[in-house]
């Protein structure tokens, strides 16, 4: 399955955080979603191999994501705000 780290993270506002994702082996497409409590998941960014397909919902002044060698991916929030409190979901597909 898709592996993510860390499972939980607590930080103070105005600090930074990063999340790591390892997709299912052989999956070319990787997605990062943000799910705020009581809401559905919102797509932040979609990768096809190394390239970004859609990052229109990603606030580029504080969020960034990269996918190295078309495999692992990192999502950064730098710095975070109170309203960034959410579950960050990684998914992959062929």
């Amino acid at each position: 399955g898709v592996a993510q780290s860390p499972r939980y993270k607590i930080i103070e506002k105005r600090q930074s955080v990063a999340f790591w994702c390892n997709p299912i082996s052989g999956h070319a497409t990787l997605y990062w979603y943000q799910q705020i409590l009581g809401q559905g998941p919102k797509l932040l960014i979609q990768f096809q191999n190394n390239g970004v397909v859609d990052d229109s919902q990603l606030p580029k002044d504080r969020f960034s994501a990269e996918r190295l060698k078309g495999v692992d991916s990192t999502l950064k929030i730098q710095p975070a705000k109170l309203e960034d409190s959410a579950v960050y979901l990684c998914a992959s597909s062929l």
């Epitope: 860390p6 105005r14 600090q15 930074s16 955080v17 990063a18 999340f19 790591w20 606030p59 580029k60 002044d61 504080r62 969020f63 960034s64 990269e66 990192t74 950064k76 730098q78 710095p79 705000k81």
Partner: antibody, heavy 117, light 119 residues
């Protein structure tokens, strides 16, 4: 192409306020934050504050009581106001665009301020 | 606030030799694993600063003569506190002031700067 153009006065007296407008082109203020940095004569760089893409602001602790930053997304303008000027506020003031992936990648040309009576 | 202490304040290096600039953080500036929120800027007189290292990544178009490495000075939790910018071999165009910057926390903070002179 991406540009940040600053306008503002060059000489002010103590206790007056500095107002600078940073007009941007080539990108949208709804996607990027604009930060303000100053450099005093012969000294280093000092981060002053930021207005984020969502319109919220953060200020350096030392300036929180006399600095305000606002913006007009439709006009692509960011407004910087520093009150109660003193001689040691004499500096070059820069606005700069920041995205996480490129940090401060584009800067304004700088506004040189002298505070003198 | 995170304090960045840069050293030396100035240094003079002969053409073709190595320049080493240090930046020490009062708190860790790594975010996760090896992801760094410590950056290096170069500033020449009359110009705004130019990003040369974004975290541990050399900016596109910047000479590979510039390298960044963290020392082994780490906090008890294994986080990196000391960073070094190395330029080798130094060229005449490298004469400038170099600043480290952290953006792990707001307020962002700069180091005090290191002025590099080429002999």
């Amino acid at each position: 192409q991406v540009q940040l153009k600053q306008s503002g006065p060059g000489l002010l007296q103590p206790s007056q306020s500095l107002s600078i407008t940073c007009t941007v082109s080539g990108f949208s203020l709804t996607n990027y934050g604009v930060h303000w940095v100053r450099q005093s004569p012969g000294k280093g760089l000092e981060w002053l504050g930021v207005i984020w893409s969502d319109g919220s602001t953060d200020y350096d602790t030392a300036f929180i009581s006399r600095l305000s930053i606002s913006k007009d997304n439709s006009k692509s303008q960011v407004f910087f106001k520093l009150n109660s000027l003193q001689a040691d506020d004499t500096a070059i003031y820069y606005c700069a665009r920041r995205a996480v992936v490129a940090d401060f990648d584009y800067w304004g040309q700088g506004t040189t301020l002298t505070v003198s009576s | 606030d995170i304090v960045l202490t840069q050293s030396p304040a100035s240094l003079a290096v002969s053409l073709g030799q190595k320049a080493t600039i240090s930046c020490k953080a009062s708190k860790e500036v790594t975010i996760f694993g090896s992801i760094s929120a410590l950056h290096w800027y170069q500033q020449k007189p009359g110009q705004p600063p130019k990003l040369i290292y974004n975290g541990a990544k050399l900016e596109s178009g910047v000479s590979a003569r510039f390298s960044d490495s963290g020392s082994q000075n780490r906090s008890p939790f294994g986080n990196q506190l000391s960073f070094t910018l190395t330029i080798a071999p130094v060229e005449a165009d490298d004469a400038a002031t170099y600043y480290c910057l952290q953006n792990k926390e707001v307020p962002f903070t700069f180091g005090s700067g290191t002025k590099l002179e080429i002999k």
